[in-house]
Structure formats: C-alpha cells, structure tokens
Amino acid sequence: APTSSSTKKTQLQLEHLLLDLQMILNGINNYKNPKLTRMLTFKFYMPKKATELKHLQCLEEELKPLEEVLNLAQSKNFHLRPRDLISNINVIVLELKGSETTFMCEYADETATIVEFLNRWITFCQSIISTLT
C-alpha cells in the first residue's frame, strides 16, 4: 500500500510535470507570438485511455516529437532549451510510471495538434492530483 510520504512525493512530481506542461502550452499559446502557428503541422498521438500513472508511457513515447516541435519555437519563449525541458519531463515521467512493469501504450485513432496534446496531458495530471489530495 502506498505510504503518505510516497503519495506526497507522487503528488509533488505530478505538480512539477503539470507546471512544465503548462509552461510549454503558455509559451506556444502566447498571443504575442502567433507566428508559432507553424507548430500546427506537427501531429501527436493521444492515448486511448489515460487514467493511471502507467499510462504516462504514452506521454513518454511522444516526448521526442514534442522536442522536435519545440525546436521551431524561439528559445525566448521558454526558460530552458527544448532538449533540457524535455529531459526534465522525461525524468519525472519515468519516476512516476515506474519501470517494474512494461505497459504497451494504446493510441486513439484521432491525432492531435500540439495544443490538443498538451491540454490532454494537463487534464490527466490535474485528474490524478485531485485523487491524491
């Protein structure tokens, strides 16, 4: 059974992941930078189901494409270089989903733009956090 300390750690990691994803979304949605519409050509794959931490496998598999699309953005939109930002997210995702069991991600048929993709994972983080608090 999860201890209160492990639950607290999980919550903090999810909050960190949530902040990172929100920072990216804010950076690309910035009304002062509509030139980033070029990012809308990139296609992202969404999870069929995302209700448990193991489903973060689906996010992990999309981190490389996420880094590629962020490379189109000017670095001033983010505090960190895309590579460092994605590396940070990857570390959190790996810790959260665990590596004991291998989970095969199932993707939905419909693809998503970067905005839809980020919103989906932001909602996921918020949902899991709410069950922990």
Epitope: P34, K35, T37, T41, F42, K43, T111, T113
Partner: antibody, heavy 121, light 108 residues
C-alpha cells in the same frame, strides 16, 4: 472582408529585375505568415517560401533559395516577391496566400488573385 | 528534397466516390492539407489537419491519413468537383513545405 490583392501582370526581358506585391486587408497582417506559390503554365503548384511580417522571418524552399527574395512591409500590410535578374523560366503565375492559424490550422485560407509574370526577349 | 506523390488523374462518374492519395515519408508525423484548384482560379482549402473541413466546404469532401499516406475522398462527386487537387505538408523538420504533384479529377 479578409483579402489579399496582388499587383498586376508584368512583361519583362531576361536579366531585368522585378518586384511584385501582395497587399492584405481585413485582418491583422502582422500576425499571419504569408506564402508565395509558383504555377507554371499547365503545371502544378510549387511552394516558394514564407514570411512572417511581424519580424520578417523567412523560410525558402531549397529550389528557390537564392533565386528570389521574399520581404514584407508591415506598415503598409504588403508582402513582396522579387527577382534581381529574371530568366525566361521564371514565366509563371505567382500567388500569395495567408497561412491561417485558428480554424484552418496551418492551411492557406486566403489567396491572392495571382500575378502573371512573362519573361521574354 | 522532400516529395509528396499523387496519382496524375482520377476519373469518376457523377454520384460515385473519388479517392485521391498522397504519399510522403513524413506524413505519419505531419498533417496533410488539401487544395482544390478549378481552371483559371486560385486554389481553395478543402481539408486541413488530415480530416478537418473548413466552413463552407461541402460534407462530401473528407480526409483521412494512415501511415505515410493521406487520402482525400469525394463522396457523391458532382460535375462542379472537376478540378485539380493538391496535397500540401511539411518535411520532417517542419521548416520546408511542399505541394503534392497534383491530381486531375474528371467527373464524367
């Protein structure tokens, strides 16, 4: 009404220079990428390049890099396509188009009427 | 340089279904856009982001994508659909864009 109005048809001699224009109206010209597209007679569409009038960042097709220059003057909501030395092979219809954002994603949702360029000695 | 390949022509009888394909290595990760160009006119966007239809475009136009192939479908083709159709997308870097080779649709 959102529209792009292009300059009129041009007839030039090989080696001459040329600058054609594309004026936007009915929207915030600064905030949308403008693309240029070539169509030779009876042929398909060819992407030449794009410009973001807000800061004049450009991207060129490798096929057109060094052959043409794309520029914009946001103060008069106008984008330009220019040649320093025309060739007979530059004879074509040239379209400007706005990359949408919003409802059309990256799709080019508004097009100019086209400018015919004829280069002949 | 990056290429998008389309069949040169597709013929269809009025009321029948026309399918136009567009093949490109980057399409699993990049959206396809479709343009209709009628003779002597500027192109018109008919499908964006693989399958979304702009307002004002008839429901008979639909799009899909699977792997390296995007498809434009005209269900119940009409005489006024006779035109050239071009797919449009970007290379893997997202920095350079390209039109497909174009497909002439004839409604016999």
């Amino acid at each position: 009404e959102v529209q792009l109005v292009q300059s009129g048809a041009e007839v030039k001699k090989p080696g001459e220079s040329l600058k054609i224009s594309c004026k936007g109206s009915g929207y915030n010209f600064t905030n949308y990428w403008i693309g240029w597209v070539r169509q030779m007679s009876g042929k398909g569409l060819e992407w030449m390049g794009i410009i973001y009038p807000g800061d004049s960042e450009t991207r060129y097709s490798p096929s057109f890099q060094g052959q043409v220059t794309i520029s914009a003057d946001k103060s008069i909501s106008t984008a330009y396509l220019q040649w320093s030395s025309l060739k007979a092979s530059d004879t074509a219809m040239y379209y400007c188009a706005r990359h949408g954002g919003g409802w059309s994603g990256w799709g080019m949702d508004v097009w100019g009427q086209g400018t015919t360029v004829t280069v002949s000695s | 340089s990056y290429e998008l390949t389309q069949p040169p022509s597709v013929s269809v009888s009025p009321g029948q279904t026309a399918r136009i394909t567009c093949s490109g290595d980057a399409l699993p990760r990049k959206y396809a856009y479709w343009y209709q160009q009628k003779s002597g006119q500027a192109p018109v966007l008919v499908i964006y982001e693989d399958s979304k239809r702009p307002s004002g475009i008839p429901e008979r136009f639909s799009g899909s994508s699977s792997g390296t192939m995007a498809t434009l479908t005209i269900s119940g083709a009409q005489v006024e659909d006779e035109a050239d159709y071009y797919c449009y997308s970007t290379d893997s870097s997202g920095n350079h864009y390209v039109f497909g080779t174009g497909t002439k649709v004839t409604v016999l």
